[in-house]
Interface confidence: low
């Protein structure tokens, strides 16, 4: 039978919530990332913006979690089609907004 | 602790068939794509074949393609590798490797290798 | 079919650097893997997405990726370090391994 394609998504659903929860300090030194449009390819595009992030453990595992849902090599300073144009949030925002998002495509089933 | 067992290998005649078979503990063993490769006798790695972690899909080498068919039970935790019409280069030691968390199997590296288990083919 | 090419055999004096190449077109388009086999064992991942190393490979293993070629580092090489080496990289739905280095420690 198929392997439920939830298990990949619950477990980056919560490594993205214990990010939020143990948050004390900025998160990654307050770094900035790329903003996405998160309608589609969320996972090649997430993992572009936050590949540009470097030195910060907190994110080390969601990185190489989404590295798992995108199919091609990315590479820092990659350009995404799907990057919001000139719009750059905190690492924290982001974070926060993939979570959301994410958590709406479990909801609805939409795993990949 | 992650283990995988394989078992199944033997000594068959050209033509014959087998099935190894791989146990494996200490995982979510549904979450991960897993692989098979062998190694001939003082030869190098060959990927034979795999089986997604995120779907059904299955990747065949061309060298075993249309004569090998990997299949997984995630209620038993195992992996199978059924292989038929065999012959004397399919002789190596069969390795049944966890291939990472993720949709995309090929991009977590073969992070656990079983012990392996041989299969020799000859009459 | 797509090709690896590595050099059969490398040697390096204890404390020096072993350098292991791995060719194949536009490999650096793809992830590279880099594996370590002791004789009589199974293979060990050193090296994944060209440069990363897993937990509990020691910082003398790096790796690096671009244009045609994917390179192994040993540096401050040791006698443990002796060992069969392959590349790894993923094309159209299949995985394709280096032809292996051996890597002697003199």
């Known amino acids: 039978s198929p392997v439920p394609p939830s298990t990949a998504l619950k477990e980056l659903i919560e490594e993205l919530v214990n990010i939020t929860q143990n948050q004390k300090a900025p998160l990654c030194n307050g770094s900035m990332v790329w903003s996405i449009n998160l309608t589609a390819g969320v996972y090649c595009a997430a993992l572009e913006s936050l590949i540009n992030v470097s030195g910060c453990s907190a994110i080390e595992k969601t990185q190489r979690m989404l590295n798992g849902f995108c199919p091609h090599k990315v590479s820092a300073g990659q350009f995404s089609s799907l990057r919001v144009r000139d719009t750059k949030i905190e690492v924290a925002q982001f974070v926060k907004d993939l979570l959301v998002h994410l958590k709406k495509l479990f909801r609805e089933g939409q795993f990949n | 602790e992650v283990q995988l067992l394989e078992s199944g290998g033997g000594l068959v005649q050209p033509g014959g068939s087998l099935r190894l078979s791989c146990a494996a503990s200490g995982f979510t063993f549904s979450s991960y794509a897993m692989s098979w490769v062998r190694q001939a006798p003082g030869k190098g790695l060959e990927w034979v074949s795999a089986f997604s972690g995120w779907d059904v899909s299955t990747y065949y080498a061309d060298s075993v393609k249309g004569r090998f068919t990997i299949s997984r039970d995630n209620s038993k935790n195992t992996l199978y590798l059924q292989m038929n019409s065999l012959r004397a280069e399919d002789t190596a030691v069969y390795y049944c490797v966890q291939d990472g968390l993720g949709p995309y199997f090929y991009n977590y590296g073969m992070d656990v290798w079983g012990q392996g288990t041989t299969v020799t083919v000859s009459s | 079919s797509y090709e690896l090419t590595q050099p059969p055999s490398v040697s390096v004096s204890p404390g020096q650097t072993a350098s292991i190449t791995c060719s194949g077109d536009k490999l650096g388009d793809k992830y590279s893997f880099w594996f370590q086999q002791k004789p009589g064992q199974s293979p060990v991942l050193v090296i994944y997405?060209?440069?990363k190393r897993p937990s509990g490979i020691p910082e003398r293993f790096s790796g690096s990726n671009s244009g045609d070629t994917a390179t192994l580092t040993i540096s401050g090489t040791q006698a443990m370090d002796e060992a069969d080496y392959y590349c790894?990289?993923?094309?159209?739905?299949?995985?394709?391994f280096g032809t292996g280095t051996k890597v002697t420690v003199l």
């Open positions: 790894q990289a993923w094309d159209s739905s299949t995985y394709v």
């Open positions: 997405h060209d440069s």
